[in-house]
Amino acid sequence: FGDEEERRCDPIRISMCQNLGYNVTKMPNLVGHELQTDAELQLTTFTPLIQYGCSSQLQFFLCSVYVPMCTEKINIPIGPCGGMCLSVKRRCEPVLKEFGFAWPESLNCSKFPPQNDHNHMCMEGPGDEEVPLPHKTPIQPGEE
């Protein structure tokens, strides 16, 4: 391979998406960003939900959308499966609604493959322990 050949995968530079089981991505991401700095700007708005802990899969799910997994073997980035999206949405949408906000259209679960197969590769994500949602009023997540 010559130096002039474009690298297929790039290191993930967004710290909240490091150490999640894969470490390279390829832009554009699944919402159309070409630069990781643009992805980062939007990702930071989800920190309250991540810290609140509405879903143990939320961070992995968001990262799989904003910095999807890349592998040298496959030309297309690998994002989340629809099942993981639905699981996260089911647990986190009520928290967003408490704030007075809707589930983001950019995270519409119908955009993602229902399950991982040879035709539509996607990440199932880590298992989401089925514990009850916190009973604490989620108006100000992270408040002590």
Partner: antibody, heavy 119, light 107 residues
Framework: EVQLVESGGGLVQPGGSLRLSCAAS????????MHWVRQAPGKGLEWVAY????????YYADSVKGRFTISADTSKNTAYLQMNSLRAEDTAVYYC????????????WGQGTLVTVSS | DIQMTQSPSSLSASVGDRVTITCRAS??????VAWYQQKPGKAPKLLIY???SLYSGVPSRFSGSRSGTDFTLTISSLQPEDFATYYC?????????FGQGTKVEIK
């Protein structure tokens, strides 16, 4: 109740420095990115900088890069904007603003603090 | 940087009028657009997020829509308290950028 209160504005000579503070209450600063937006007299809104203290991200508008530094002290629940090498064109009301969770708009703003750069 | 070109820069209208303000992004910003209302000496207030979602507590006479890179804020029936300056904002690309504002004045 969520509140953002800015302070530290005032009159400063060109080339001088000023530090603005944004005291947050009603939520934990570590859970949110915080932004500074400014508005020159009679003009529109200009985004200045943001910090995500939880992840350590900062980002600046080109117009202030290298002169302004954004920081946060989560123990005091306060964000700061250190402004150095101030210019006449930095004269503005400076607002701190909190982004809506999981969305792309500012749902809470401070009342603003006026910075005047003049000799 | 992404340019958000807002028009008109000012308009005169009467109570009860339907008012439309437009913002055009210099390239696609998806639906990551918000609209704000600002009155003299006050901080801006969020009206619309994600191009078309009404923020909690905002009267239903305000609405937002998107067509490609064109974004529209509509006030269906202008009320006396709506005379103010309105700004659009994109949050798709860094840096965040605002439109130059539209001042809605009493005719």
């Amino acid at each position: 109740e969520v509140q953002l209160v800015e302070s530290g504005g005032g009159l400063v000579q060109p080339g001088g420095s000023l530090r603005l503070s944004c005291a947050a209450s009603g939520f934990n600063l570590s859970s949110y990115s915080m932004h500074w937006v400014r508005q020159a007299p009679g003009k529109g809104l200009e985004w200045v900088a943001y910090i995500s203290s939880y992840y350590g991200y900062t980002y600046y508008a080109d117009s202030v890069k290298g002169r302004f530094t954004i920081s946060a002290d989560t123990s005091k629940n306060t964000a700061y904007l250190q402004m150095n090498s101030l210019r006449a064109e930095d004269t503005a009301v400076y607002y701190c603003a909190r982004p809506a969770p999981g969305h792309w708009g500012f749902d809470y703003w401070g009342q603003g603090t006026l910075v005047t750069v003049s000799s | 940087d992404i340019q958000m070109t807002q028009s008109p820069s000012s308009l005169s209208a009467s109570v009860g009028d339907r008012v439309t303000i437009t913002c055009r992004a210099s390239q696609s910003v998806s639906s990551a657009v918000a609209w704000y209302q600002q009155k003299p000496g006050k901080a801006p207030k969020l009206l619309i997020y994600s191009a078309s979602s009404l923020y909690s507590g905002v009267p239903s006479r305000f609405s937002g829509s998107r067509s490609g890179t064109d974004f529209t804020l509509t006030i269906s029936s202008l009320q006396p308290e709506d005379f103010a300056t309105y700004y659009c904002q994109q949050w798709y690309y860094a840096p965040i950028t605002f439109g130059q504002g539209t001042k809605v004045e009493i005719k």
